[in-house]
Interface confidence: low
């Protein structure tokens, strides 16, 4: 195949670290309109496995604010509005990409990091272990 | 607040695009061990609002594979194992960062993109609108 000339606007890749270090444009292309999970829905209150949203803030990370869900109860809310301990409220987790400043306090140098966050809670049937 | 002096080992930031374009080290620091949501738990099957996981694949994006949750039912599973339509299964959504190569044909230049993914489902009490 023909080698297409590299776009002349490309960052220099003759670096000894290439391709371990890349340039990332932070002008985020946002395909969504609603960014605040507290405003996006009231599911956290209406769920049979309700949760609270805790603000996790870290200025050395991008995004600096991440909302973490914590289930309110061990059990789930039944039709009477009481906690039913025959069911379990459990967090639904998601692995996300974040950027961490590295070295620390450098405004334009980051490392990719994967972290696990709890997004909300769901009500599950418990796994019952029967003792013989 | 106190301004922390810039680390002298920081990369040069006198770029005309600074701080929109940053350097990112690709040696990902992964704080998690389990990356496949299908293996991480069986909540998607045990939930009262069960869901299926669909593979969303895009070779031009990092990560190229994202798992999307689709609720199996409009209602929720009751104690008898039947679908109760007095309750609603709804997706819990999370905004995540992904990387997309930009401009095209640059091997080491990317743009951050935010996308909304459904991580799992939860069972909620429906909002009932009473007609006067």
């Amino acid at each position: 195949g023909i080698t297409i000339p590299r776009n002349p606007g490309c960052p220099n890749s003759e670096d000894k670290n290439f391709p371990r270090t890349v340039m990332v444009n932070l002008n985020i292309h946002n395909r969504n309109t609603n960014t605040n999970p507290k405003r996006s829905s009231d599911y956290y209150n209406r769920s049979t496995s309700p949760w609270n949203l805790h603000r996790n803030e870290d200025p050395e990370r991008y995004p600096s604010v991440i909302w973490e869900a914590k289930c309110r109860h061990l059990g789930c809310i039944n039709a009477d509005g009481n906690v039913d301990y025959h069911m379990n409220s459990v967090p639904i987790q998601q692995e996300i990409l974040v950027l961490r400043r590295e070295p620390p306090h450098c405004p334009n140098s980051f490392r990719l990091e994967k972290i696990l966050v709890s997004v909300g809670c769901t009500c599950v049937t418990p796994i019952v272990h029967h003792v013989a | 607040g106190i301004t922390i002096p810039r680390n002298p080992g920081c990369p040069n930031s006198e770029d005309k695009n600074f701080p929109r374009t940053v350097m990112v080290n690709l040696n990902i620091h992964n704080r998690n061990t389990n990356t496949n949501p299908k293996r991480s738990s069986d909540y998607y099957n045990r939930s009262t609002s069960p869901w299926n996981l669909h593979r969303n694949e895009d070779p031009e994006r990092y990560p190229s594979v994202i798992w999307e949750a689709k609720c199996r039912h409009l209602g929720c599973i009751n104690a008898d194992g039947n679908v109760d339509y007095h309750m609603n299964s709804v997706p819990i959504q999370q905004e995540i960062l992904v990387l997309r190569r930009e401009p095209p044909h640059c091997p080491n230049s990317f743009r951050l993109e935010k996308i909304l993914v459904s991580v799992g489902c939860t069972c909620v009490t429906p909002i009932v609108h009473h007609v006067a």
Partner: nanobody
């Protein structure tokens, strides 16, 4: 099941040539960029070359530019690396990899083929 099988390695004198091949199966080969990566004895992995889905765009690490050519045949689900003007420092196990758009992020690897450049 994804499989990548490399072949074509061997012993060659400095200045000589070799052509490595990689047979891919278990995924839609034409939908992915493909890579050659190498590991010299006692060293870490080094990304060597990348080729886009349709074969039209190739990227090379500085040290091999002008000497190595990456190519692919989507009809045969095959990836190739033509290596000319070989040097002692090219001695390594060469791996074919399917992966992400981020360099060095490969979700599947072959078993590798050893290339030894020595007189």
């Amino acid at each position: 099941e994804v499989q990548l099988v490399e072949s074509g390695g061997g012993l060659v004198q400095p200045g000589g040539s070799l052509r490595l091949s990689c047979a891919a199966s278990g995924f839609t080969f034409s939908s992915y960029s493909m890579y050659w990566v190498r590991q010299a004895p006692g060293k870490g992995l080094e990304w060597v070359a990348e080729i886009k889905q349709d074969g039209s765009v190739q990227y090379y690490v500085g040290g091999v530019k002008g000497r190595f050519t990456i190519s692919r045949d989507n009809a045969k689900n095959s990836l190739y690396l033509q290596m000319n003007s070989l040097r002692a420092e090219d001695t390594a196990v060469y791996y074919c990899a399917k992966g992400e758009i981020l360099p060095l992020y490969f979700d599947y690897w072959g078993q590798g083929t050893l290339v030894t450049v020595s007189s």
